[in-house]
C-alpha cells in the first residue's frame, strides 16, 4: 500500500486570494501611471492617443454595481492578455526611441504576466469555468514611424491604466460579496 493519505488540503480563503490579486493590480496600476508620466516627459505629445487593436474599456465606474465575479475575471483576463501582447509588441517593434524605457517596459511585462497567472489561479480556486483557449490574434503591424511607436506606447499605457483602475475598483467591490 502507498503512503497514508495526508491531511485534506484546505483550499485557501478566496478572499485572501482576491486580496493578493488586488495588491498586484494596484502595484501594476501605480507602475503604469508612473511609466506613462515618464514617457510623456520624454516625448511630450498633445491629445489622446488611440490604437484600434486595444480592447475597449470593460466598464464605466457607474456600472460597477452590476458586476458578477466570473464575468469580471474572464473579461479582465482577456483584456490583460491583449495588453501583454501589446507591451511585447512595443518592446519588439517600438523603435529606438523607446529603448530608453526598456528596463521599465520589461518590468511592466513581467508584472503583467504575473498578474495574469494570479488571475488564472484565482479562477481555478473559485472553481470558475475556465475560458476557452484564446484564438490566435492577428499580428500587430509595426509602427509606421518612431513617432508612431511613441504614440502607440502612450495609447497602450493609457488604456492599461484605465483597465487596471477599473479592475481594482471591481475586485474590491466583488470582495465584499464573497
Amino acid at each position: 500500500p502507498g503512503p497514508p493519505p495526508g491531511p485534506p488540503r484546505v483550499s485557501p480563503d478566496p478572499r485572501a486570494e482576491l486580496d493578493s490579486t488586488v495588491l498586484l493590480t494596484r502595484s501594476l496600476l501605480a507602475d503604469t501611471r508612473q511609466l506613462a508620466a515618464q514617457l510623456r516627459d520624454k516625448f511630450p505629445a498633445d491629445g489622446d492617443h488611440n490604437l484600434d487593436s486595444l480592447p475597449t474599456l470593460a466598464m464605466s465606474a457607474g456600472a460597477l454595481g452590476a458586476l458578477q465575479l466570473p464575468g469580471v475575471l474572464t473579461r479582465l483576463r482577456a483584456d490583460l492578455l491583449s495588453y501583454l501582447r501589446h507591451v511585447q509588441w512595443l518592446r519588439r517593434a517600438g523603435g529606438s526611441s523607446l529603448k530608453t524605457l526598456e528596463p521599465e517596459l520589461g518590468t511592466l511585462q513581467a508584472r503583467l504576466d504575473r498578474l495574469l497567472r494570479r488571475l488564472q489561479l484565482l479562477m481555478s480556486r473559485l472553481a470558475l469555468p475556465q475560458p476557452p483557449p484564446d484564438p490566435p490574434a492577428p499580428p500587430l503591424a509595426p509602427p509606421s514611424s518612431a513617432w508612431g511607436g511613441i504614440r502607440a506606447a502612450l495609447a497602450i499605457l493609457g488604456g492599461l491604466h484605465l483597465t487596471l483602475d477599473w479592475a481594482v475598483r471591481g475586485l474590491l467591490l466583488l470582495k465584499t460579496r464573497l
Epitope: 486580496d19 488586488v22 495588491l23 498586484l24 494596484r26 502595484s27 496600476l29 501605480a30 501611471r33 508612473q34 506613462a36 508620466a37 515618464q38 510623456r40 516627459d41 520624454k42 511630450p44 474590491l172
Partner: antibody, heavy 120, light 108 residues
Framework: EVQLVESGGGLVQPGGSLRLSCAAS????????MHWVRQAPGKGLEWVAY????????YYADTVKGRFTISRDNAKNSLYLQMNSLRAEDTAVYYC?????????????WGQGTLVTVSS | EIVLTQSPATLSLSPGERATLSCSVS???????LSWYQQKPGQAPRLLIY???NLASGIPARFSGSGSGTDFTLTISSLEPEDFAVYYC?????????FGQGTKLEIK
C-alpha cells in the same frame, strides 16, 4: 546637500491670489518629481500637488483643483505654486518636497515652509 | 481616496520604553507604497521609513517599520528624548497621495 527654500507666503484676502516659489539646490533638479504639501495651523499634513521632472504630468488634490497651478522652471531650479481664488481654509504652512529616488519612496527632502494666511 | 487612520491619537511613554504606532489603511495597498514621517514643533516633517520597512538616510536603527495590506506599524525600540514628536504615515500608491492624521508621542 539638498536644500529647498520656499518663499512668497503672506497675508491675502479671500478671493485673492499668491504665488509661492521653492528654490532648489544640491541636486539635479530636472531629474526629480516635486510636490507641494501643506499644514493648517495645529492640523496634520495634506498633499496638494505633484509635477513630474519634465512638467508633462501633474496631479492635484481635489480641494485645490481648478484654483491652484503647480509649475517648474528647470533652468532656474525652481518650483512654483500659483494660488488663485484663495479661501480661509487654504491658510497653512506650505512645504515643497522632493521625492526620494523613485516615485514610491516618499517625500525625502522638505523645505522649511512658508506661511499663507487667508483672512479679511 | 485612500484614507489612513492612525492610532492612538496620543501615546504617553517614558524614555527607554518601546513605542508602537499603528496606521490602518481603508483599502489594500502594496507595502512598497507606505512611508512614515516624524515632525517636531516648528519644523518640517522628516522621512523616517519608506516602502514600509526601509530606513531613510541618517535614521537611527531603533526605528523600524512593518506591516502589509491594510495594517502597518512603526516601532521605536527604545525611546530617546529626541523621539517625542508627531508621527505620520502616508500612502503613495494612489492619487491623491494621503497622510494619516498623526500620532503624538509625548513624554509621560
Amino acid at each position: 546637500e539638498v536644500q529647498l527654500v520656499e518663499s512668497g507666503g503672506g497675508l491675502v484676502q479671500p478671493g485673492g491670489s499668491l504665488r509661492l516659489s521653492c528654490a532648489a539646490s544640491g541636486f539635479t533638479f530636472s531629474s526629480f518629481g516635486m510636490h507641494w504639501v501643506r499644514q493648517a495651523p495645529g492640523k496634520g499634513l495634506e498633499w496638494v500637488a505633484y509635477i513630474t521632472p519634465g512638467s508633462n504630468t501633474i496631479y492635484y488634490a481635489d480641494t485645490v483643483k481648478g484654483r491652484f497651478t503647480i509649475s517648474r522652471d528647470n533652468a532656474k531650479n525652481s518650483l512654483y505654486l500659483q494660488m488663485n481664488s484663495l479661501r480661509a481654509e487654504d491658510t497653512a504652512v506650505y512645504y515643497c518636497a522632493r521625492e526620494y529616488y523613485s516615485y514610491d519612496e516618499g517625500f525625502a527632502y522638505w523645505g522649511q515652509g512658508t506661511l499663507v494666511t487667508v483672512s479679511s | 481616496e485612500i484614507v489612513l487612520t492612525q492610532s492612538p491619537a496620543t501615546l504617553s511613554l517614558s524614555p527607554g520604553e518601546r513605542a508602537t504606532l499603528s496606521c490602518s489603511v481603508s483599502d489594500l495597498i502594496p507595502s512598497q507604497y507606505l512611508s512614515w514621517y516624524q515632525q517636531k514643533p516648528g519644523q518640517a516633517p522628516r522621512l523616517l521609513i519608506y516602502r514600509t520597512s526601509n530606513l531613510a538616510s541618517g535614521i537611527p536603527a531603533r526605528f523600524s517599520g512593518s506591516g502589509s495590506g491594510t495594517d502597518f506599524t512603526l516601532t521605536i525600540s527604545s525611546l530617546e528624548p529626541e523621539d517625542f514628536a508627531v508621527y505620520y504615515c502616508q500612502q503613495g500608491v494612489d492619487v491623491p497621495f494621503t497622510f494619516g492624521q498623526g500620532t503624538k508621542l509625548e513624554i509621560k
